[in-house]
């Protein structure tokens, strides 16, 4: 299966060129997409190329500036966000990261109706988040851990919390585990519908075990960066969830949500937060142990000027058989009653479907069935569901986008994509204007990613957003790989790879193969998905076999293959690289002298384990930012698939899961060991405690570090880490510089 | 020096409405800093809250007796007044008006009326 | 409602005494206490807010301690103008509840 622009004459092959690293390196061949800003049913804001802030409305076909370059560049705005009213603009300046999603800015407020910044009452800085109300001009924010609420922009900020602390107390905002493992954002408070309430989360973390790591800048001395971080087992963050009215937020003042009682008598999470209306909200909880959720909808109860959460409005979501969810557990989408959702969890057979819940979850109307999983579910409208599954022609890693009229009975189902670029798109998300009356598609591939702007009754094209034309002209001339998805049926297992082969690829040869794995619990790397990296420069100018396996423990493919893996880490993906590369021996075009491995953190850690299989297959490989241990990775994703660290838990397989435990097997493979020194997320530790184990068994290995780089390793180490990665494999594989 | 004066009837009759005013002297009425409350005292019993009123008119009752309290505000006179219907001897009690601070948090009635006594009697 | 709970109800003290006076909610209310005095025939006089914040004007001798659900009110070295009745109050959450008193007489 070739899933590739088509080339147009043979004889212009003379004329066309391999991918080289510098290409891959400078980005030459990045894709846009194009999101439109959401502002009503009809009317869409995009920053343009020259940096103007443009209002677009569909249905007059009439675009216009609301903010101009020169406004943008006088605060060097980086980005903007209208007010609901459309009578503000904040624009957000000296961005600095803090973790994946967290960072600081400096806000100004522009007032459009006067074309004026707004001078009084200003924003301190740097803010760590901020946002409007959906209804108005009403601005919450966080400073210095605390929340703010200004009524209007000019006006004096009221402090709704006074608790915050660096490091200690966390208002609005998530701690680090909280941002990384379970919310995915940087921001833990919500406005309700129309702004009469806003929802917020304290994190406290005074008890929590901190990480200390030296960040070596430039100074005489190295800094010492601390975050509080819970490695497996160890003493997790307190939470509590505050609701306060912001008309008159002073007088009651924040009122806690109360923790369902099943999930308060022992260690727990809250993973997410959904406003159902003004005046109800729904929370969701999990037990430490991850494999029960409870679902709770409480309610403004207006005498009290509190919040209650009746036990018949709890919903209990219960794995069996693995951890609750997928990744995470799935969020419900309420529907137009207010009371009843649709939410995606297992089916009977162990798929992940939709299921609509009007009073319990044991009497759940099974809305979407079959041996696929539906994905994600975009919008519900009075008369239609839009949500993203892998049904289509039963290929996991293809997104197809569905409406199912749920108006009607018995509801239809629709494909609104799978026929539209058939062979360019088969990876598709959604971006929907209010109430669905119009949608963007973005497709990623397998083709060159295309944007398109769609009718939401209808599904009409509208027209194109972006459709990459210079990417398209600039790959004109080069050779691309061949690209294939297929699938090995082993032990009734189902493996699908994905191979990338160099443009000349001719079976009857030998190449060189490169397992390129991550392999995560609920991960897949097996995507229709149009990419040019570094994988693609190496099939391309290097002439080497590059694969992508998802084995056991990956995601999309049911319940069985998901929870192989629980309370395993560490055995079955493994297992099933190894497996894939006997069989991709078998295909009779790999050369076995030369196959290589390399991953990146649970990708490393996976890779280092293959290599220290003793199975004798890897010649090499390589492990960017591995973990090398769960007792030393995060509490939240460790424990979910691991269980506890304790003698009456699962400390056993803690214990034999480590790559240090099997250093003495790296004695016959080439092994290059990569870490970022400043890695907060999975910590240099790790690598230093294979790099010990390996020298204690006198081991040679290879390594390279880079200083105060996190586990991204961006900006000039990018550069440096592909370079050597490629010398390493090229030396490794023999083949010429 | 901020002055709060309760004025009313000293006895009403069971099932009518008790009503008072409380008159703020020596401060403005219509400032966003403070509520301005209501408490009651039966005799040789403690205090309970009735409820509170902003300046622009948002009240908070007291759930138990919500249904037969109405408080409202007039910043012209610098006023606000307190309805209780329905009365039944339950009600005898000293009734005192007082500003409730509430900026920063928590509140609490820094100024109080000196009260007076309302009789539920036929 | 959160129901404020003081104990004792009455105590006995002379002058000079330390004297101490608790206040249980049976939720937490977090600091969110204050305490009032009441001398017969008057109207409460308020003087500590936010469980421990001495309003001004009020003699250094009272404090108050606690957060969560557990609250004192200490007299240091009871003078004979302290001789009333205390009432904890707490702001968290409507209504407004008092506690239901102690009195603080002369032995």
């Known amino acids: 299966i070739v899933l590739r622009p088509s080339r147009v004459h043979n004889s212009e092959e003379n004329t066309m060129r391999a991918l080289t690293l510098k290409d891959i390196l400078n980005g030459t061949f990045s894709y846009k997409t194009f999101f439109p800003n959401w502002i009503s049913g009809q009317e869409y804001l995009h920053q343009s190329a020259d940096n103007n802030i443009v209002l677009y409305n569909i249905e007059t076909g009439q675009s216009y500036t609301i903010l101009s370059n020169r406004t943008m560049k006088s605060v060097n705005a980086s980005n903007y966000g209208l007010s609901p009213d459309r009578q503000f603009v904040y624009l957000e300046s000296d961005y600095s990261k803090l973790w994946r999603y967290s960072y600081t800015a400096t806000y100004y407020i522009y007032d459009l109706s006067n074309g004026e910044f707004v001078r009084g009452n200003e924003l301190p800085r740097p803010i760590q988040y901020l946002c409007w109300s959906p209804v108005g001009s009403k601005l919450a924010y966080v400073y210095q851990n605390n929340i703010y609420l200004k009524q209007r922009p000019g006006d004096p900020p009221f402090q709704i919390t006074f608790n915050g602390r660096e490091n200690k107390i966390f208002n609005g905002i998530p701690d680090w585990v909280y941002e990384e493992e379970m919310l995915a954002t940087k921001y833990a408070l919500w406005w309700s519908p129309n702004g009469k309430f806003l929802a917020y989360a304290e994190f406290n973390d005074t008890d929590i075990p901190v990480i200390a790591y030296s960040y070596y800048g430039d100074e005489q001395y190295p800094r010492t960066i601390n975050i509080p971080y819970p490695k497996a087992g160890a003493k997790n963050p307190v939470v509590r969830i505050f609701i306060i009215d912001t008309t008159y937020p002073a007088y009651v003042g924040p009122q806690e949500v109360p923790v369902p009682a099943m999930i308060a008598s022992s260690d727990y999470y809250f993973s997410w937060l959904t406003w159902v209306t003004d005046e109800r909200v729904c929370l969701q909880w999990l037990k430490r142990v991850q494999n029960v959720s409870v679902l709770s909808i409480c309610d403004f109860r207006e005498d009290w000027q509190t919040w209650d959460c009746p036990k018949t409005q709890e919903h209990i979501e219960e794995s069996r058989t693995g951890w609750a969810g997928g990744f995470f557990v799935s969020t419900p989408v309420f529907s137009y009653d207010a009371i009843s959702y649709y939410k995606i969890f297992s089916d009977k057979d162990g798929y992940k479907h939709i299921h609509y819940i009007k009073d319990t979850v044991e009497n759940a109307i099974q809305i979407t069935s079959g041996k696929w999983e539906a994905i994600n579910i975009f919008r519900v409208t009075q008369d239609s569901l839009f949500y993203s599954s892998n049904e289509f022609e039963e290929y996991p890693g293809r997104r197809n986008i569905y409406r199912i009229s749920i108006g009607s009975y018995p509801p239809s189902k629709k494909c609104v994509t799978c026929h539209l670029r058939k062979e360019r798109c088969q990876y598709y998300t959604a971006s929907f204007s209010d109430y669905a009356k119009y949608y963007a598609l973005v497709c990623y591939g397998p083709g060159i990613p295309i944007s398109t702007l769609h009718d939401g009754r209808t599904d009409q094209e509208i027209k194109i957003l972006e459709e990459n034309k210079e990417l398209e002209n600039a790959l004109k001339n080069i050779q691309l790989p061949k690209e294939e998805i297929k699938k090995l049926e082993v032990d009734e297992i189902t493996l699908w790879y994905k191979m990338i082969l160099p443009p000349q690829f001719d079976r009857s040869k030998k190449y060189p193969l490169l397992i390129q794995v991550y392999g995560g619990p609920c991960s897949q790397s097996v995507r229709s998905v149009f990419a040019v990296n570094w994988i693609s420069y190496l099939a391309s100018k290097e002439g080497m076999v590059i694969a992508l396996v998802d084995g056991r423990g990956t995601a999309f493919q049911g319940d069985k293959l998901l929870y192989a893996v629980y309370r395993k880490l560490g055995v079955y993906e493994v297992e099933d690289q190894i497996t894939a590369v006997r069989k991709f021996i078998e295909m009779g075009f790999i050369d076995e002298k030369r196959i290589a491995i390399w991953g990146w953190s649970y990708g490393g850690y996976v890779s280092s384990l293959a290599l220290a299989s003793g199975t004798g297959l890897f010649k090499c490989g390589i492990a960017v930012a591995p973990v090398s241990s769960w007792e030393y990775y995060a509490s939240v994703y460790t424990e979910r698939f691991m269980g506890l660290p304790t003698k009456d838990d699962n400390l056993e397989h803690y214990k034999n899961s480590t790559v240090m435990a099997r250093a003495e097997y790296f004695r016959n493979v080439d092994y290059l060991l990569i870490h970022g020194t400043a890695d907060d997320n999975v910590h240099f530790q790790n690598s230093a405690q294979i790099a010990k184990a390996l020298v204690n068994a006198q081991v040679d290995f290879q390594a390279m570090w880079y200083s105060d780089q996190n586990h991204g390793l961006s900006g000039l180490s990018t550069n440096h880490l592909y370079t050597h990665m490629t010398h390493f494999l090229k030396q490794c594989f023999s083949l010429s510089d | 020096q901020l002055q709060l004066q309760e004025s009313g009837p000293g006895l009403v009759k069971p099932s009518e409405t008790l009503s008072l005013t409380c008159t703020v002297s020596g401060g403005s009425i219509s400032s966003s800093t403070y509520y301005w409350g209501w408490i009651r005292q039966p005799p040789g019993k403690g205090l309970e809250w009735i409820g509170s009123i902003f300046y622009s008119g948002n009240t908070y009752y007291n759930p138990s007796l919500k249904s037969r309290v109405t408080i409202s505000v007039d910043t012209s006179k610098n006023q606000f007044s307190l309805r209780l219907n329905s009365v039944t001897a339950a009600d005898t009690a000293v009734y005192y008006c007082?500003?409730?601070?509430?900026?920063?948090?928590?509140?609490?009635?820094?100024?109080w009326g000196q009260g007076t006594l309302v009789t539920v009697s036929s | 409602d959160i129901q404020m709970t003081q104990s004792p109800s009455s105590l006995s003290a002379s002058v000079g005494d330390r004297v101490t006076i608790t206040c249980r909610a049976s939720?937490?209310?977090?600091?969110?206490l204050n305490w009032y005095q009441q001398k017969p025939g008057k109207a409460p006089k308020f003087l500590i807010y936010a469980a421990s914040s001495l309003q001004s004007g009020v003699p250094s001798r009272f404090s108050g301690s606690g957060s969560g659900t557990d609250f004192t009110l200490t007299i240091s070295s009871l003078q004979p103008e302290d001789f009333a009745t205390y009432y904890c109050q707490q702001s968290n959450s409507i209504p407004r509840t008092f506690g239901q008193g102690t009195k603080v007489e002369i032995k």
């Open positions: 007082a500003r409730e601070i509430i900026e920063p948090r928590p509140g609490y009635f820094d100024y």
């Open positions: 939720q937490s209310i977090s600091k969110y």
